[in-house]
């Protein structure tokens, strides 16, 4: 029988490589029975998660699953880091496996500093 | 009924390189991290890398990083696993396993594929 | 990477014997989820791997209730609390907390 405990589908130590200035829908699958739960969105910084109150968010339906989205118009470059959703149920938390956002910052990825510049910022090369 | 079905063994000469198929069934592949391991005769498991067939993000062994390449076709819910340059201490059984990627649920195996690298 | 010990190589037993492989990891295998993602496989001659325990203590399906998992941190054990003909095999521990995953040398468990 299936459970009817809320379940979120975020892979654990998934990944997501984006370019900043693309538009980007970062989705938290909801597995859900009766009442559709109250679902955040926070980023990691260190151990604590920091809840992202003044976001674009929607829900997306589906026939077995619905989604909260995250959206990201235009991907910044300090959108970079983990996210992880976060659905109350019952007076429960329940958490998602943090999932991880890489950006490419389109413009300093096509002006590459040269190697003088390179040698005079070491802290570059690590 | 769950499976990891593997293309049949290969025999290959030093420096070519072989493509090990897998295709899966039972489960939908993008619920899952496919990963790719092998064995050498008589020897442990070794971690080879692991692809998300969901978005294709793939992690490799520092080992096979430039060498490995694996990939998979969600259509045809089916992992391959490319190695070049292949040298003779590469004779091995290699596996794919799938893991359910969201709350470990399962891990499936595949039967293995023996590729033996040989002049 | 972490490196992953098991003990003993292999182990000689009889059938109906309490059996305990340990695992030893070079770092924490504890993830940010507060999980230690450590496996134990079993594998027979010519056979592929199968995975019997997931998350240090959890019983894949299937899998009898003579084995059992534990352990936390750093170290961890496998136990068969009576031995069955069909147990013996090599089992190895794996981690995929941190990559790259690793898998520990396997102990070989045979028939005394």
């Known amino acids: 029988k299936e459970s009817c405990d809320v379940q979120l589908y975020i892979k654990r130590q998934s990944e997501h490589s984006i370019l900043a200035g693309d538009p980007f829908e970062l989705e938290c699958p909801v597995k859900y029975c009766a009442n559709r739960p109250h679902v955040t969105w926070c980023k990691l910084n260190g151990t604590t998660c920091v809840k992202l109150e003044d976001r674009q968010t929607s829900w997306k339906e589906e026939k077995n699953i619905s989604f909260f989205i995250l959206h990201f118009e235009p991907v910044l470059p300090n959108d970079n880091g983990s996210y992880r959703c976060s659905a109350n149920f019952q007076s429960n938390l329940i958490e998602s496996h943090s999932t991880t956002l890489y950006v490419t910052d389109v413009k300093s990825a096509s002006e590459r500093p040269s190697k003088d510049e390179m040698a005079s910022r070491p802290w570059l090369l690590y | 009924q769950v499976q990891l079905v593997q293309s049949g063994a290969e025999v290959k000469k030093p420096g070519s390189s072989v493509k090990v198929s897998c295709k899966t069934s039972g489960f939908n592949i993008k619920d899952t991290y496919i990963h790719w391991v092998r064995q050498a005769p008589g020897q442990g498991l070794e971690w080879i890398g692991r692809?998300?067939?969901?978005?294709?993000?793939?992690k490799y062994a520092q080992k096979f990083q430039g060498r490995a390449t694996i990939t998979a076709d969600e259509s045809t819910s089916t992992a391959y696993m490319e190695l070049s340059s292949l040298r003779s201490e590469d004779t091995a059984v290699y596996y794919c396993?799938?893991?359910?990627?969201?709350?470990?649920?399962?891990?499936?195996w595949g039967q293995g594929t023996l590729v033996t690298v040989s002049s | 990477d972490i490196q992953m010990t098991q003990s003993p190589s292999s182990l000689s037993a009889s059938v109906g014997d309490r059996v305990t492989i340990t695992c030893r990891s070079s770092?924490?295998?504890?993830?940010?989820?507060?999980?230690?993602?450590l496996n134990w496989l079993q594998q027979k001659p010519g056979k592929a791997p199968k995975r019997l325990i997931y998350l240090v203590s959890k019983l894949d399906s299937g899998v009898p209730s003579r084995f059992s998992g534990s352990g936390s941190g750093t170290d961890f054990t496998l136990t068969i609390s009576s031995l069955q003909p069909e147990d013996f095999a090599t089992y190895y521990c794996w981690q995929d907390t941190h990559f790259p995953y690793t898998f520990g040398q396997g102990t070989k468990l045979e028939i005394k």
């Open positions: 770092q924490s295998l504890l993830d940010r989820d507060g999980k230690s993602y």
């Open positions: 692809n998300d067939p969901a978005n294709g993000n793939t």
């Open positions: 396993a799938s893991y359910e990627g969201y709350y470990e649920r399962f891990g499936y």
